[in-house]
Interface confidence: low
């Protein structure tokens, strides 16, 4: 009778084990072990027991002890079970960003590991078990589908293997994959709202605002604002699930024409964009041209108004004939035209909007000097000792200098209150002088004495 000890062993892959083969007869003809494993016999006293060290056990094996006794040959098997943890536990790679509401398939692959009967694969979100299945196949594959939710944002998904050898008196061996950190996002199907001027004048600034609601996580959203090739640098303010990006846009003559304004929002691996056209225009104020800004009375004056080639102008409220960018009028300068304003208004249509620009110029008419009866009476009669104010107003542009003298020396105090005396009586020569010339007028002052009353 042949026996073996131990009859059943569980050992780590590559490990060694001592196996004792015994026989019941004292003088066996033969006692040994049959195994493909590397073996070493340990020398023991006696003939009916042998101990072998079996090494580098890589897989399950059934070494067999045999003995040949006088009463016949017999055998006994020992069962070696090898255990080892998986060589690879891995989640199939996935895009780090996943839209909320999408079904996400987690796939865990496990290579190796034994005994398979004791090997379980567990898919986890954080510490929460999503699925637990025995490892089947090589590589073993376990999948589960997760409906992506907002609160999954930042969650770590992983795969764990459990080799449970506690029933065999050993421990629970765990291997965990590298985690997959899920970044969830919501990018609404609606494009961002873009508010901007439809038209913008060269060398001015405009404000552009781009906004979108219903984003998650809003802090991860990237906003790109551009006018043509010009990247704008917005100030972004965030709400709970919204943002508003505000930028100033400056345009130059190089930008003139129709430009594309773009607002794009990128979140996760998706983007939404809104396009709008902005017409950049150049529209200088119209030009008012006077033949000369300063003319003498009686001179012919041409007033011209010139504007942008596509503009329509009116000069002093009168539209150009025919309607267009130029208008003019002719006049003979009179003193009444001095200080007269000539106003030109130009209107340009840009992308369906009417833009208005104005310019005004003033005409200076040089005339005079003038001394007439109305403003400088030729005869004054005043009672002696009365209080009087001699008045004589000379007109002209530029304003003339006025002097009234009696006998070339005695001045009449124009515009001053005086007490009438005999000395005041007489004929005065009033002379008004300016760059435009000189005029004279005689003024007689009569004084009534009390004796004549």
């Amino acid at each position: 009778q042949t026996s073996v000890s131990p009859s059943k062993v569980i050992l780590p892959r590559g490990g060694s084990v001592l196996v004792t083969c015994s026989t019941s007869c004292d003088q066996p003809k033969l006692l040994g072990i049959e195994t493909p494993l590397p073996k070493k016999e340990l020398l023991l006293p006696g003939n009916n027991r042998k101990v072998y060290e079996l090494s580098n056990v890589q897989e399950d094996s059934q070494p067999m002890c045999y003995s040949n006794c006088p009463d016949g040959q017999s055998t006994a098997k020992t069962f070696l079970t090898v255990y080892w943890t998986p060589e690879r536990v891995e989640l199939a790679p996935l895009p780090s960003w996943q839209p909320v509401g999408k079904n996400l398939t987690l796939r865990c692959q496990v290579e190796g590991g034994a005994p398979r009967a004791n090997l379980t694969v567990v898919l986890l979100r954080g510490e929460k078990e999503l699925k637990r299945e025995p490892a089947v196949g090589e590589p073993a594959e376990v999948t589960t589908t997760v409906l992506v939710r907002r609160d999954h944002h930042g969650a770590n998904f992983s795969c764990r293997t459990e080799l449970d050898l506690r029933p065999q008196g050993l421990e629970l061996f765990e291997n965990t994959s590298a985690p997959y950190q899920l970044q969830t996002f919501v990018l609404p199907a609606t494009p961002p709202q873009l508010v901007s001027p439809r038209v913008l004048e060269v060398d001015t600034q405009g404000t552009v605002v781009c906004s979108l609601d219903g984003l998650f996580p809003v802090s991860e959203a990237q906003v790109h604002l551009a006018l043509g090739d010009q990247r704008l640098n917005p100030t972004v303010t965030y709400g709970n699930d919204s943002f508003s990006a505000k930028a100033s846009v400056s345009v130059t003559a190089e930008d003139e024409g129709t430009q594309r304004l773009t607002c794009a929002v990128i979140l996760g691996n998706q983007s939404q964009e809104t396009l709008q056209t902005v017409t950049i225009y150049s529209f200088p104020a119209p030009n008012v041209i006077l033949t000369k800004p300063e003319v003498s009375e009686g001179t012919e004056v041409t007033v011209k108004c010139e504007a942008h080639p596509r503009a329509k102008v009116t000069l002093n409220g009168v539209p150009a004939q025919p309607l267009g960018p130029r208008a003019q009028l002719l006049l003979k300068a009179t003193p009444e035209d001095n200080g007269r304003s000539f106003s030109c208004s130009a209107t340009l249509e840009v992308a369906g909007q009417l833009i208005h620009k104005n310019q005004t110029r003033e005409l200076r008419v040089l005339y005079g000097p003038r001394l007439d009866e109305r403003d400088c009476p030729g005869n004054w009669t005043w009672p002696e000792n009365s209080q009087q104010t001699p008045m004589c107003q000379a007109w002209g542009n530029p304003l003339p200098e006025l002097k009234c003298l009696k006998d070339g020396t005695f001045p009449l105090p124009i515009g001053e209150s005086v007490t009438v005396t005999r000395d005041l009586e007489g004929t005065y020569l009033c002379r008004a002088r300016s760059t435009q010339g000189e005029v004279t007028r005689k003024v007689t002052v009569n004084v009534l004495s009390p004796r004549y009353e």
């Epitope: 895009p95 691996n269 983007s271």
Partner: antibody, heavy 120, light 107 residues
Amino acid sequence: EVQLVESGGGLVKPGGSLRLSCAASEFTFSDYFMSWIRQAPGKGLEWVSYISSGRSPYTNYADSVKGRFTISRDNAKNSLYLQMNSLRVEDTAVYFCARVRGPGDVFDIWGQGTLVTVSS
Amino acid sequence: DIQMTQSPSSLSASVGDRVTITCRASQDVNTAVAWYQQKPGKAPKLLIYSASFLYSGVPSRFSGSRSGTDFTLTISSLQPEDFATYYCQQHYTTPPTFGQGTKVEIK
């Protein structure tokens, strides 16, 4: 100026090991995912590995280096590392470290690269 | 893994020319494609990301567009400093993968 400077390259025999370092400056290093990308002589670009931001970062590797290379970071030192073991002749390349910006793996800042030569 | 197939592998052009480089993804990558420029002995530089967004500091003569799984990098008027190798890259999923490169040479 935002900068990444690699070091640690050199000549090594097949089966040998090497540790590459990448020093970051002028940006908040701990906020960014970081990556290693390599370029074999006269060839194109190949992504090697990345490491996430956060207190307990996670890592990912190209199949060609999995189990042999280990990426790590030290936020206190503003440094990124690549431990390369069991090196093969086909690992000969210029290794670049790069900063990752969203969305996905866009590499916006690159170091000048360090040459690793594996030859017997 | 997603394959990125770039064409042509090289081209000759003159200063002032309009240059177009194409990249095709083996599967849908949404708009997640970046373009890089690399000069000999230097590190690559990011030009475009998310198919059409110009990275800050990149001249406006560079632009990108998408049509399905085909992506295009256009240089509207080639400048002397633009002679280099250009790579596309998908940043839709891990692992990120690059095109084999297009070398733009002086005619």
